[in-house]
Interface confidence: medium
């Protein structure tokens, strides 16, 4: 399905079910009452038990490119989030103190993300051509690490998953992760015309230039980000159902679970000719810039189920449920949105004529 | 083939210990999930507990919280089970098992050690 | 926990007649649920697995039914070397469950 082609006092869309039954799991149990091994108690975690997890350096991909952002106005946010495994970045949450360029200073940067998208005044760029991707059909295994952060659900990427932005720009993804509201609320990250979708996967990567995301942090185009809204469709979605059908599993933050492989393709579009692009930067702190965005024109069905399940399955810090994790759209301050097509004619009888008022700045892209 | 060859079953007292290897071989052994699964004579099968492949995801069954520990060395492709303050209700077989690699049922099981809690 | 519930105890079918096994959860686990053989003095062996899909090796005699909370495993001509233990159990939410058996044996 395309983007669709709204006016601009449309009301918001939502995308959540109003269903009540829980996710059913066929492939890992759930946690309905998880008995689980006990880290050496601290007073602040009982009488919580926590899952044994794996060491790792001092800065994660999650605390990263989760690329989520503080909270909408409008969009009430309650998750407060603090990685317990050892944040790079200070605390922060969506929606609350501190501000987050007291967390990062470059969250206060002019060229920031998610932006809301205007495909009419998007500028046709030929040069775009269709993506390419290598590898991401994943076996079975080895398995594959999926974890409640806190403020996402993230699934970490190994090595050999290549994407190449045009000749001679060839990135490798290190994570993806999704975006999501509550019942009856939208919560993707970008917006189209103001319209807020159900919910966007994000598939994070970073330049085969840089070895480590510290170096490429910051750099143009040190980190490229593809992303996909989620709408509600009327069949289940059995990529995406490979992902939900283990929340349960990690349904308290910081608590992560094993999945098999899968293939990373099926979770985004089957069209990668047609998208929109610009330069913005990771959604959450530390918000560094110079992160190349690509945004798919067509959307990616999951059935209302599982976006119920999305939404409701997960739980942030305390008794906060993990829901609206998206962060407001940031001004263009400039910027120009390219597209890889021309923008379409209105089916209304008043558009003649596609209005692109911007011409394409990237002819090398 | 894959093969899974429990040891270090035994007679022990009440309030003893023992420590359960499994002891893996024919695939490998980090990319699987395992569990212990024991059963008591002349009864039914029953789980006891699971590590992910990793390590990093544990579950107990309530009858063993706090008292059992189960762990793995995927350089050895071996899998642990420290079993303390045992009692008669633990007497059974201990079944090693992997777990599939998609799906979570157990596809392929040891033979089983014996441990049996006696005074 | 969900409690898994098996019938009959004890199946006996002559040989070459249909056996069929119930299995009965607590609450729905979907399609999370498998079935097992053990005979005799040996571990015990994957037959089905997400209710319906039989394992590696498992000839097509063994076949699997149901969801949610009803199951069926039935063994389409039963043989001697048929007769075992046959456990279900669950795997849609921790802890994992096994039914208490069924022995099937011949008439």
């Known amino acids: 399905q395309r983007l669709p082609r709204m006016q601009e006092d449309s009301p918001l869309g939502g995308g959540s079910s109003g269903e009540d039954d829980p996710l059913h799991e066929e492939d890992l149990p759930s946690e309905e009452d998880p008995p689980r091994e006990e880290d050496p108690p601290r007073e602040e975690d009982l009488p919580e038990v926590k899952p044994k997890s794996e060491e790792e350096g001092s800065l994660k991909l999650e605390d990263l490119p989760t690329v989520e952002a503080p909270g909408d106005p409008q969009e009430p946010q309650n998750n407060a989030h603090r990685d317990k495994e050892g944040d790079n970045q200070r605390h922060w949450r969506y929606g609350g103190d501190p501000p987050w360029p007291q967390v990062s200073p470059a969250c206060a940067g002019r060229f920031q993300s998610p932006v809301d998208i205007r495909p009419q005044l998007a500028a046709f760029c030929p040069a775009l051509r269709p993506l390419e991707l290598l590898g991401f059909e994943l076996p079975l295994l080895p398995e594959l690490r999926l974890r409640n952060n806190g403020h996402s659900v993230q699934l970490t990427l190994p090595s050999g998953l290549e994407m190449a932005l045009g000749p001679g720009r060839e990135y490798r993804a290190l994570q993806l992760h999704l975006h999501w509201g509550a019942v009856g609320r939208p919560g993707s990250e970008h917006t189209v015309e103001g319209h807020r979708f159900p919910a966007e996967i994000h598939v994070v990567h970073i330049s085969t230039a840089y070895a480590r995301v510290e170096e490429a942090l910051g750099r143009p185009g040190g980190l490229a980000v593809l992303a996909a809204f989620l709408e509600e469709g009327p069949e289940e979605n059995s990529a995406y159902e490979q992902l939900l059908s283990h929340l349960e599993e990690i349904a308290e933050e910081g608590s992560e679970t094993q999945v098999p492989g899968l293939d990373v393709s099926a979770l985004l579009p089957s069209d990668l000719s047609r998208y929109f692009r610009y330069e913005g930067s990771l959604t959450t702190p530390p918000c560094a810039q110079g992160v190349i965005w690509t945004v798919f024109n067509q959307t990616v069905m999951l059935s209302a189920k599982q976006l119920h399940a999305l939404s409701d399955a997960l739980w942030g810090p305390g008794d906060s449920r993990l829901q609206l994790n998206f962060r407001v759209t940031q001004p263009l301050n400039g910027r120009v949105i390219e597209a890889s097509f021309p923008a379409e004619v209105d089916s209304s009888p008043r558009a003649a004529e596609p209005v692109q008022l911007n011409s394409c700045l990237a002819a090398g892209d | 083939q894959v093969q899974l060859v429990e040891s270090g079953g035994g007679l022990v007292q009440p309030g003893g210990s023992l420590r359960l290897s499994c002891a893996a071989s024919?695939?490998?052994?980090?990319?699987?999930?395992m569990s212990w699964v024991r059963q008591a004579p002349g009864k039914g099968l029953e789980w006891v507990s699971y590590?992910?492949?990793?390590?990093?995801?544990?579950y107990y069954a309530d009858s063993v919280k706090g008292r059992f520990t189960i762990s793995r060395d995927n350089a050895k492709n071996s899998l642990y089970l420290q079993m303390n303050s045992l009692g008669a209700e633990d007497t059974a077989v201990y079944y090693c098992?992997?777990?599939?690699?998609?799906?979570?049922?157990?596809?392929?099981w040891g033979q089983g050690t014996t441990v049996t809690v006696s005074s | 926990e969900i409690v898994m519930t098996q019938s009959p105890a004890t199946l006996s079918v002559s040989p070459g007649e249909r056996a069929t096994l119930s299995c009965r959860a607590s609450q729905s686990v979907s399609r999370g649920l498998a079935w097992y053989q053990q005979k005799p003095g040996q571990a015990p062996r994957l037959l089905i697995y997400s209710a319906s899909t039989r394992a590696t090796d498992i000839p097509a005699k063994f076949s699997g039914s149901g969801s949610g909370t009803e199951f069926t495993l039935t063994i389409s001509s039963l043989q001697s070397e048929d007769v075992a233990v046959y456990y279900c159990?669950?795997?849609?939410?921790?802890?994992?469950?096994f039914g208490g058996g069924t022995k099937v044996d011949i008439k």
């Open positions: 159990q669950q795997y849609n939410k921790w802890p994992l469950t």
């Open positions: 024919g695939f490998t052994f980090s990319s699987y999930s």
């Open positions: 098992a992997r777990h599939r690699s998609y799906r979570f049922a157990l596809d392929y």
């Open positions: 590590i992910s492949s990793s390590g990093s995801t544990i």
